[in-house]
């Protein structure tokens, strides 16, 4: 009888482990504004917080500016990027701006980078207004394999809003791969 | 034997209850336009539907204009806010508008409010065009504790689009806290 | 004893089947730009990829330009729509554009269509700039019944960005209906 119960319990524990929602990986990374690159061209943002304020990570890794997948699965990925400029910060080089975000996936096995999601807008930020602001939000559902890396590229990084509620990206696992 | 089975069944039922996805809290609240405040400054929106049309709520509470968390967990929060103006609605005070949304979390234990997500844009809505429209979308993954409250603040509330498909916010629990 | 075990195992397998996250439906559909309608009025987009690049589908069906629900449940739905214009593509008929997306649900039983989510912006795309771009993102949590269909309508379809990272929509099931 005990052997039978042990067998059932083993199965049960196995299911518990597998279905245990606590094990689902996630990350919510917020911009670290102490190290934002300058320029207006597309650059990769490598400085993000993972353990302060709203930033958190579990069963994923943050390393070298990239969010690394540790567990195969289908994930919902998202990013919110805010740009802003106040006249007291100085004059813009041009009123015509391309404010963009690109969420990219890099596979180490096949050293290649692909854009999963992009968003943004061309903007006319005239000197007639003392303050300008613009936010982009993108999100989507993607198959990610262990070892793959997610990174964020933006244009005009010097215009990024450094607040944790403004500029962030994240991921959470929704389900296993069949 | 029955005692053994009862014990296994007890464990199994416990797991079923815990992992039962039906128990996962969620809410999708749509704007109640019968009570939108005026002004152009940031205000908290307190009138939302929770049980008509697309609006719905389960294992969360809507009270005093706030979405109250009843179950600890990690939640995906989102908001979609649309602003619109037609020349027949009247003349705008300024062409330079700051159309913003702030998703805030309030803890009753520590009476403090913090912005989880923000988004929006400065817009130039000139009288040369008969119709203007702009939508904001924000989303992110956050740890919420029972008793914490989620609320929405916007600028220029009198410009909100009152349709249920336009102005709404919501949350759904993704996983437990470890 | 075996009968007892079989009974417990039956229950366990039933739970395994029901809670098995692998069974959760999802779809991520990317624009098929070989067949984008022209015009500036609101049109339904019927050409989407479901099995190439980032596009994928499981336990849902794509047919006649619509995403068909096969399994009752609460789903998170999302769409990202990008519009762009380069001066080399020709002159725009008007500088004042309404760039919009509508995510609609159609029930076959009751032949009616309802908008679940909308987003977008009015834009002034002047000839003074060689390139214009704008992206919309919407997302929300909805109860969907088997047989219901999700489709995407946009204004100005000829301005759509045809990249798979730019114009897409999707859904994933979060939980069962109680």
């Amino acid at each position: 009888i005990r052997a039978e119960k042990a067998m059932v319990d083993g199965s049960w524990l196995d299911l518990a482990k597998r279905s245990k929602l606590e094990a689902q990986p996630f990350a919510h990374l917020t911009i670290n504004a102490t190290d934002i690159p300058s320029g207006s061209h597309k650059v990769s943002l490598s400085s993000w917080y993972h353990d302060r304020g709203w930033a958190k990570i579990s069963n994923m890794t943050f390393s070298n500016g990239k969010l690394i997948v540790n567990q195969d699965g289908f994930y919902y990925l998202y990013a919110n990027i805010c740009f802003r400029h106040h006249e007291t910060s100085g004059d813009l080089a041009t009123e015509y701006l391309q404010l963009m975000v690109y969420v990219t996936k890099t596979s180490i096995k096949i050293p290649s980078s692909h854009t999963l999601m992009k968003g943004g807008s061309t903007k006319y930020w005239s000197g007639n207004s003392e303050f300008h602001f613009y936010s982009i939000n993108v999100g989507g559902f993607f198959k990610l394999r262990s070892g793959e890396e997610i990174s964020i590229e933006v244009s005009n990084p010097s215009l990024l809003d450094p607040d944790q509620d403004a500029t962030y990206f994240g991921a959470f696992k929704v389900r296993d791969i069949d | 034997i029955r005692a053994e089975k009862a014990m296994v069944d007890g464990s199994w039922l416990d797991l079923a209850k815990r992992s039962k996805l039906e128990a996962q809290p969620f809410a999708h609240l749509t704007i109640n336009a019968t009570d939108i405040p005026s002004g152009s400054h940031k205000v908290s929106l307190s009138s939302w539907y929770h049980d008509r049309g697309w609006a719905k709520i389960s294992n969360m509470t809507f009270s005093n204009g706030k979405l109250i968390v009843n179950q600890d967990g990690f939640y995906y929060l989102y908001a979609n806010i649309c602003f619109r103006h037609h020349e027949t609605s009247g003349d705008l005070a300024t062409e330079y508008l700051q159309l913003m949304v702030y998703v805030t979390k309030t803890s009753i234990k520590i009476p403090s409010s913090h912005t989880l997500m923000k988004g929006g844009s400065t817009k130039y809505w000139s009288g040369n065009s008969e119709f203007h429209f702009y939508s904001i979308n924000v989303g992110g993954f956050f740890k919420l504790r029972s008793g914490e409250e989620i609320s929405i603040e916007v600028s220029n509330p009198s410009l909100l689009d009152p349709d249920q498909d336009a102005t709404y916010f919501g949350a759904f629990k993704v996983r437990d806290i470890d | 004893i075996r009968a007892e075990k079989a009974m417990v195992d039956g229950s366990w397998l039933d739970l395994a089947k029901r809670s098995k996250l692998e069974a959760q439906p999802f779809a991520h559909l990317t624009i098929n730009a070989t067949d984008i309608p022209s015009g500036s009025h609101k049109v339904s987009l019927s050409s989407w990829y479901h099995d190439r690049g980032w596009a994928k589908i499981s336990n849902m069906t794509f047919s006649n330009g619509k995403l068909i629900v096969n399994q009752d449940g609460f789903y998170y739905l999302y769409a990202n729509i990008c519009f762009r214009h380069h001066e080399t593509s020709g002159d725009l008929a008007t500088e004042y554009l309404q760039l919009m997306v509508y995510v609609t649900k159609t029930s076959i039983k009751i032949p009616s269509s309802h908008t679940l989510m909308k987003g977008g912006s009015t834009k002034y795309w002047s000839g003074n700039s060689e390139f214009h771009f704008y992206s919309i993102n919407v997302g929300g949590f909805f109860k969907l019944r088997s047989g219901e269909e999700i489709s995407i309508e946009v204004s100005n379809p000829s301005l759509l960005d045809p990249d798979q990272d730019a114009t897409y929509f999707g859904a994933f099931k979060v939980r069962d209906i109680d």
Partner: nanobody
Framework: EVQLVESGGGLVQAGDSLRLSCAAA????????MGWFRQAPGKEREFVAA????????GYVDSVKDRFTISRDNTKNTVYLQMASLKPEDTAVYNC???????????????????WGQGTQVTVSS
């Protein structure tokens, strides 16, 4: 110090035209909504017209629509009120007013305006 100085008033015949000016100083003019009000003898002050910060939105009281035109020149910090087809009932002291945009729509109530000029007299004889 904030200053709003009206000019251009006077005595005219019914059917004539007049152009009022209001020169502003002491605040960032282009960020303020500008309005014109008037007060006839023995009556309360009433809203006449208002103009948005950038000048593309204008609002009028029904009685002056299609006869009066409000405009502004942000480079000169001046707001104007062009009055045509004047009537005896247009006789009043005309005041210029300014406010930051605290509402989405043009303010039409005098309590919504922060700064006021001394006024200029307009008299329309029949």
């Amino acid at each position: 110090e904030v200053q709003l100085v009206e000019s251009g008033g006077g005595l005219v015949q019914a059917g004539d035209s007049l152009r009022l000016s209001c020169a502003a100083a002491g605040f960032t003019f282009r960020r303020y909504v500008m309005g014109w009000f008037r007060q006839a003898p023995g009556k309360e002050r009433e809203f006449v017209a208002a103009i948005s910060t950038g000048g593309t939105w204008t609002g009028y009281v029904d009685s002056v629509k299609d006869r009066f035109t409000i405009s502004r020149d942000n480079t000169k910090n001046t707001v104007y009120l062009q009055m045509a087809s004047l009537k005896p009932e247009d006789t009043a002291v005309y005041n210029c007013a300014a406010t930051t945009p605290t509402t989405s729509y043009l303010p039409r109530s005098e309590r919504q305006y922060e700064y006021w000029g001394q006024g200029t007299q307009v008299t329309v004889s029949s």
